[in-house]
Amino acid sequence: QSPIFGPQDVSSIEGNSVSITCYYPDTSVNRHTRKYWCRQGANGYCATLISSNGYLSKEYSGRASLINFPENSTFVINIAHLTQEDTGSYKCGLGTTNRGLFFDVSLEVSQVPEFPNDTHVYTKDIGRTVTIECRFKEGNAHSKKSLCKKRGEACEVVIDSTEYVDPSYKDRAILFMKGTSRDIFYVNISHLIPSDAGLYVCQAGEGPSADKNNADLQVLEPEPELLYKDLRSSVTFECDLGREVANDAKYLCRKNKETCDVIINTLGKRDPAFEGRILLTPRDDNGRFSVLITGLRKEDAGHYQCGAHSSGLPQEGWPVQAWQLFVNEESTIPNSRSVVKGVTGGSVAIVCPYNPKESSSLKYWCHWEADENGRCPVLVGTQALVQEGYEGRLALFDQPGSGAYTVILNQLTTQDSGFYWCLTDGDSRWRTTIELQVAEATKKPDLEVTPQNATAVIGETFTISCHYPCKFYSQEKYWCKWSNDGCHILPSHDEGARQSSVSCDQSSQIVSMTLNPVKKEDEGWYWCGVKEGQVYGETTAIYVAVEERTRGSPHINPTDANARAKDAPEEEAMESSVREDENKANLDPRLFADEREIQNAGDQAQENRASGNAGSAGGQSGSSK
């Protein structure tokens, strides 16, 4: 007896699809060995049609797949567009040859069933409406018309022209004639349910002269579309229920033992398990809509159904569409932090993974909002201006080739708490959800800028200092000027770097940035931050106002003077005279390191490790797809 198990007999009709699951014993060897599906020939040879090694035969091209689920010790063979030629004996098995462990499967594909000439077949999905056409001769034009349903030998009346309607068809069945037609009557049955399926007889007249027609009604459960998604990726359920329900509330539910539990609907209901990672988007006026779920978890696997009803809840006899979602745990999407914590006044650096093959794709960051359908307006993007309310405190740092970009948000408030999505205009599977939790700060921030009321005077020299604790000693410190297209790193000077790491003096760890001479366009937000390679850490922001020099004011900025008097060794006080010459070595003559560190151009070049742009310019706001 084979340890492989599967369906012994599979039967379907032409044009349909089948999904054949084969179960294998849970061993490491079995999980990783080749899986195959082959067709048994008369000569005893089993010809491979598809295997997990990537082989796909010509006759299966474009219509079959084999997917291994090692965590369940199963593999699934999906075959679409069946024809009668697919009828035969098959094997699903494991091993490097087709003679290893296997299970025999018989597949039978029949023609769509035919009925006697006088039987009309109506095939409808659950929830839809069927119109049964009943022909009669002129002699029965004024006779009673009826439709009955066969139950064994009896035929129970569903509706007739005397206005009788069977209670189980109440408000669902109508009998009518169209225009001036004298030889056809019609019966509409709406909100079809599975028990409506069966053989119907429509009749005009009584006795031997009566005209009768047979109608076979098939009410189909929706065939679930199979969706295979990776852990942590996203899935979109595209739901098209037809114009007749365009104005009804829409929902997506997940089937369980007794019911279908609503995950989201257009009336504002949302399952807490999907908080922050679900969006329902109307597509058009014909009732089409889509539901996007990001950050897929193992427990999200299962059967989903979308539907429409004024209550926003599943109702029998209303149209539905179905899916079966599989979540593959062998994911290409890296595991990133799902919760990031910050404190008021502080900052967070959020790493967003993206498909490394798509480093040129546009990157975005949006804030998930819990309005009735969920929405995610873009706050920042590589070609999207920073949204109002986030100026000076939000920037996106792209790191091409690294498979990740970083979003930094500072000046945090408790209102920033919530869910945010990382997304790109490329591979839609790589959408990640982060929950930001901002708590009230209980201590001073790690980075502090002085002076705190920063006003620079045009034409003068202005220095701002950023104090950092010893724990950031070994990290790279930087200043950057914030603009709508990122935060562009500036030359700066780290005063703590001179000290030995053994004797770190908490009070004198400073990274400074000097504007000389100050210009009007220097006004704006500046950030002081720390980073290690491509990994960004804490940041703090300060707004530098720029004003005209008032007559009679000294040329030296008082804050600089105070700083110099307090900090500078006496012998360095003379260096101000050579500053003009030294500045010529700078990339930007107005921005340079603190004067006490300008010893030679070599030192300066070493100090001014300015990394490239953080973000690219211009462009319109993107939207989440």
């Epitope: 198990f5 369906p7 012994q8 007999d9 599979v10 039967s11 379907s12 009709i13 349909n16 699809s17 089948v18 999904s19 054949i20 699951t21 179960y23 689920f69 369940n72 199963t74 699934v76 349910i193 599975p194 028990s195 189909l220 459960e221 929706p222 065939e223 679930p224 089937k255 369980n256 033992k257 007794e258 696997a301 299962g302 059967h303 029998e316 179905a322 079966q324 599989f326």
Partner: nanobody, 130 residues
């Protein structure tokens, strides 16, 4: 309330045949899969056969110990399932239980596992005499 009612059990001679039926009832109960398990005294519940359907596609599963002897089928409405038992042996003696699922399960769920079936009947006794 969903109910599964088994019938057709009884005493049968070795080599004989028996046909078990299981009818599912409940106002809107439309099962997605139905199956048969059996339990002999002092033994664990054992998978016999199952039938699962999706639209016009049907999947039939048969346990290894009854392969080639037992077949499973259902009626057109899908609310009754049958187990045709041929060439019965004394070791087929057991209480036969009907099981049903209303919800399409993840197709990776093994039908042989009793834990994954939602509804159960009360059982019908089959005794094979030698």
């Amino acid at each position: 309330e969903v109910q599964l009612v088994e019938s057709g059990g009884g005493l049968v001679q070795t080599g004989g045949s028996l046909r078990l039926s299981c009818a599912a009832s409940g106002r809107t109960f439309s099962p997605y899969a139905m199956g048969w398990f059996r339990q002999a005294p002092g033994k664990e519940r054992e998978f016999v056969a199952a039938i699962r359907w999706s639209g016009a596609t049907t999947y039939k599963y048969v346990g290894g110990s009854v392969q080639g002897r037992f077949t499973i089928s259902r009626d057109a409405a899908g609310n009754t399932v049958y187990l045709q038992m041929n060439s019965v042996k004394p070791e087929d003696t057991a209480v036969y239980y009907c099981a049903a699922d209303r919800v399409p399960k993840d197709i990776s769920i093994d039908p042989r596992n009793p834990k994954d079936w939602d509804y159960w009947g009360k059982g019908t006794q089959v005794t094979v005499s030698s």
